[in-house]
């Protein structure tokens, strides 16, 4: 058993049919010695008396808010949550496996630049009685500070018969050094509590590996005289790190016909313009990637050829 | 050419060669994104590699003030990786394919380090750790880790030279 926060405790349980329960001794936080009684949750029934209450925690029915009282007055509370371990593996019932980029990916994180700011998100089908708390650091043995905000519900989607809820959090490294080569990964830890179930999820990454630039901005076409060619131009997204002479992007320009089956013409360039042939009913798209490190491409920015 | 304590390097040449290094490093080990090598307990293996750190002056401001600190750090790293790529980690079993980009990568690391430090001038270099994995699978894992680390190192070096070529070239 360990303390998650003031008056909230997590009991770690091996979860198999003939597992013994965990013996927990609750102590009433009071100088009083006599006339103390204990109750659980909303029930007014007395579970025991005395300054300590020894319980066996085996089921979610044993978790909950234990309260000690004296003469009708509440003295203190202890909320017990359960953390299940099945076959030596901590349960992951609360969050959905996103399976990208690999199985058992519960947290996904992205950064728009090298400023040390990043966003993580996760999915669940649970709609109520759910709380998240996020902590982060650079490195784990001698951790350096990363400040995370509160996790918020960022999207709701219908997936077949189920509703899926996306939560996200923004974090900022306290003393980020955008130009340095990272040697210690960022660690992100999410505590998830659903009703009386506690779970924790972690992710470890370098900012460089989670970079995904915003799409190029101000995508424009300029027809070239007496030609089917057009000059496509664009700019670096506002959110990308500066100066651009240092934090450079490379670009992919694509000409795509109306039909998905049509052959796509692709051009790669480090410049912010390119000359391409514009076919009727086609569209031109441009995306960006860090020039020197192969992290994710941005989403496409597109304009129609007409 | 970079002369210790003195003139500027050939920024444009360094830019071109460092960008080539980036391409080679990724073609030598393109699928790293699908393998989380940090899970494989790399404390004793790649923690000794020289990293370009915050105080090394490789940021735009630091380069403007005095690029020599940064260039020395990059040079150290290039020599370190050049030695690693020439060691039995890469020459031993399992053998690299004949058309593997590792050979070119090795040569380009040497080329860039020589651009930064011509014959007769010496910056102190870092000792390479004695890593001699006994098993082929250990060697393979170590190669992945070294290449992964090299990708991050040459990315910073390439940014330095690109910025230098754009803003510090005479």
């Amino acid at each position: 058993i360990w303390e998650l926060k003031k008056d909230v405790y997590v009991v770690e349980l091996d979860w198999y049919p003939d597992a013994p329960g965990e013996m927990v001794v609750l102590t009433c936080d009071t100088p009083e010695e006599d006339g103390i009684t204990w109750t659980l949750d909303q029930s007014s029934e007395v579970l025991g008396s005395g300054k300590t209450l020894t319980i066996q925690v085996k089921e979610f029915g044993d978790a909950g808010q234990y309260t000690c009282h004296k003469g009708g007055e509440v003295l203190s509370h202890s909320l017990l949550l359960l953390h299940k371990k099945e076959d030596g593996i901590w349960s992951t019932d609360i969050l959905k496996d996103q399976k990208e980029p690999k199985n058992k990916t519960f947290l996904r994180c992205e950064a728009k630049n090298y400023s040390g700011r990043f966003t993580c998100w996760w999915l669940t089908t649970i709609s109520t009685d759910l709380t998240f708390s996020v902590k982060s650091s650079r490195g784990s043995s001698d951790p350096q500070g990363v400040t995370c905000g509160a996790a918020t519900l960022s999207a709701e989607r219908v997936r077949g018969d189920n509703k899926e809820y996306e939560y996200s959090v923004e974090c900022q490294e306290d003393s980020a050094c955008p130009a340095a080569e990272e040697s210690l990964p960022i660690e992100v830890m999410v505590d998830a509590v659903h009703k009386l179930k506690y779970e924790n999820y972690t992710s470890s990454f370098f900012i460089r590996d989670i970079i995904k630039p915003d799409p190029p901005k101000n995508l424009q076409l300029k027809p070239l005289k007496n030609s089917r060619q057009v000059e496509v131009s664009w700019e670096y997204p506002d959110t990308w790190s500066t100066p651009h002479s240092y934090f450079s992007l490379t670009f992919c320009v694509q000409v795509q016909g109306k039909s998905k089956r049509e052959k796509k013409d692709r051009v790669f360039t480090d410049k912010t313009s390119a000359t391409v042939i514009c076919r009727k009913n086609a569209s031109i798209s441009v995306r960006a990637q860090d020039r020197y490190y192969s992290s994710s491409w941005s989403e496409w920015a597109s304009v129609p050829c007409s | 050419r970079a002369v210790p304590g003195g003139s500027s390097p050939a920024w444009t040449q360094c830019q071109q060669l460092s960008q080539k290094l980036c391409t080679l490093a990724w073609s030598a080990h393109p699928l790293v994104g699908h393998m989380d090598l940090r899970e494989e307990g790399d404390e004793e293996t790649t923690n000794d590699v020289p990293h370009i750190q915050c105080g090394d002056g490789c940021d735009p401001q630091g380069l403007r003030d005095n690029s020599q600190f940064c260039l020395q750090r990059i040079h150290q790293g290039l020599i370190f990786y050049e030695k690693l790529l020439g060691s039995d980690i890469f020459t031993g079993e399992p053998s690299l394919l004949p058309d593997s980009p590792v050979g070119q990568l090795h040569a380009s690391l040497l080329g860039l380090s020589q651009l930064l430090q011509p014959e007769g001038h010496h910056w102190e270099t870092q000792q390479i750790p004695s890593l001699s994995p006994s098993q082929p699978w250990q060697r393979l894992l170590l190669r992945f880790k070294i290449l992964r680390s090299l990708q991050a190192f040459v990315a910073v070096a390439a940014r330095v030279f690109a910025h230098g070529a754009a803003t510090l070239s005479p």
Partner: antibody, heavy 119, light 107 residues
Framework: EVQLVQSGAEVKKPGESLKISCQSS????????IGWVRQMPGQGLEWIGI????????RYNPMFRGQVTMSVDKSSSTAYLQWSSLKASDTAMYYC????????????WGQGTMVTVSS | DIQMTQSPSSLSASVGDRVTITCKAS??????LAWYQQKPGKAPKSLIY???SRQSGVPSRFSGSGSGTDFTLTISSLQPEDFATYYC?????????FGQGTKLEIK
């Protein structure tokens, strides 16, 4: 006052189905799991299993798994034990009981439902 | 499953006697043991839990002791209403199991 009131005695033929009930009152129904115990004529007590009224989480005695089904209706604070195909060997007194949280033993019991299966 | 063995299976005693019933578990169950009293035609009633804690409303003449594998229920001075069958139950490991019962009769 805590009360667990069980449905009346049943006489059934082999192969028939049956559902007996246990209605709880006088306490917070969702705080306490409900269990069932069998007592065959002239015999001792046998633990069938327990169930959470909150989310229908169930722990069956392996000996009874597949033989009986436990269920619960939160809205009426009622627990159920059912058989899809009774056998003569199911003849017994069945007790529902309230599981004490933080312990696991049964602190309050229903009066019992006698089930007789005979052709 | 954990076997619970009670002894004796039955015993005769008189009002005012001190009576001891023992219960042995086939493996360690800590203090997670309860005692119940059952009278003919009635439901069992909880007497003792956690091996030695008395259920609310149970007279003080009933006491429990023991831990691990050996447990005892003691009635310090038998009363006429105490003649019944007594069961021990372990609630440490699923499935929770009962002893076979001890029938306490009037001598």
């Amino acid at each position: 006052e805590v009360q667990l009131v069980q449905s009346g005695a049943e006489v059934k033929k082999p192969g028939e189905s049956l559902k007996i009930s246990c209605q709880s009152s006088g306490y917070s129904f969702t705080t306490y799991w409900i269990g069932w115990v069998r007592q065959m004529p002239g015999q001792g007590l046998e633990w069938i299993g327990i169930m959470s009224p909150v989310d229908s989480d169930i722990r069956y005695n392996p000996m009874f798994r597949g033989q009986v089904t436990m269920s619960v209706d939160k809205s009426s604070s009622t627990a159920y034990l059912q058989w899809s195909s009774l056998k003569a060997s199911d003849t017994a007194m069945y007790y529902c009981a309230r599981r004490r949280p933080g312990q696991g033993y049964f602190d309050f019991w229903g009066q019992g439902t006698m089930v007789t299966v005979s052709s | 499953d954990i076997q619970m063995t009670q002894s004796p299976s039955s015993l005769s005693a008189s009002v005012g006697d001190r009576v001891t019933i023992t219960c042995k578990a086939s493996q360690n169950v800590g203090s997670w043991l309860a005692w119940y009293q059952q009278k003919p035609g009635k439901a069992p009633k909880s007497l003792i839990y956690s091996a030695s804690s008395r259920q609310s409303g149970v007279p003080s003449r009933f006491s429990g002791s023991g831990s691990g594998t050996d447990f005892t229920l003691t009635i310090s001075s038998l009363q006429p209403e105490d003649f019944a069958t007594y069961y021990c139950q372990q609630y440490d490991i699923y499935p929770f199991t009962f002893g076979q019962g001890t029938k306490l009769e009037i001598k």
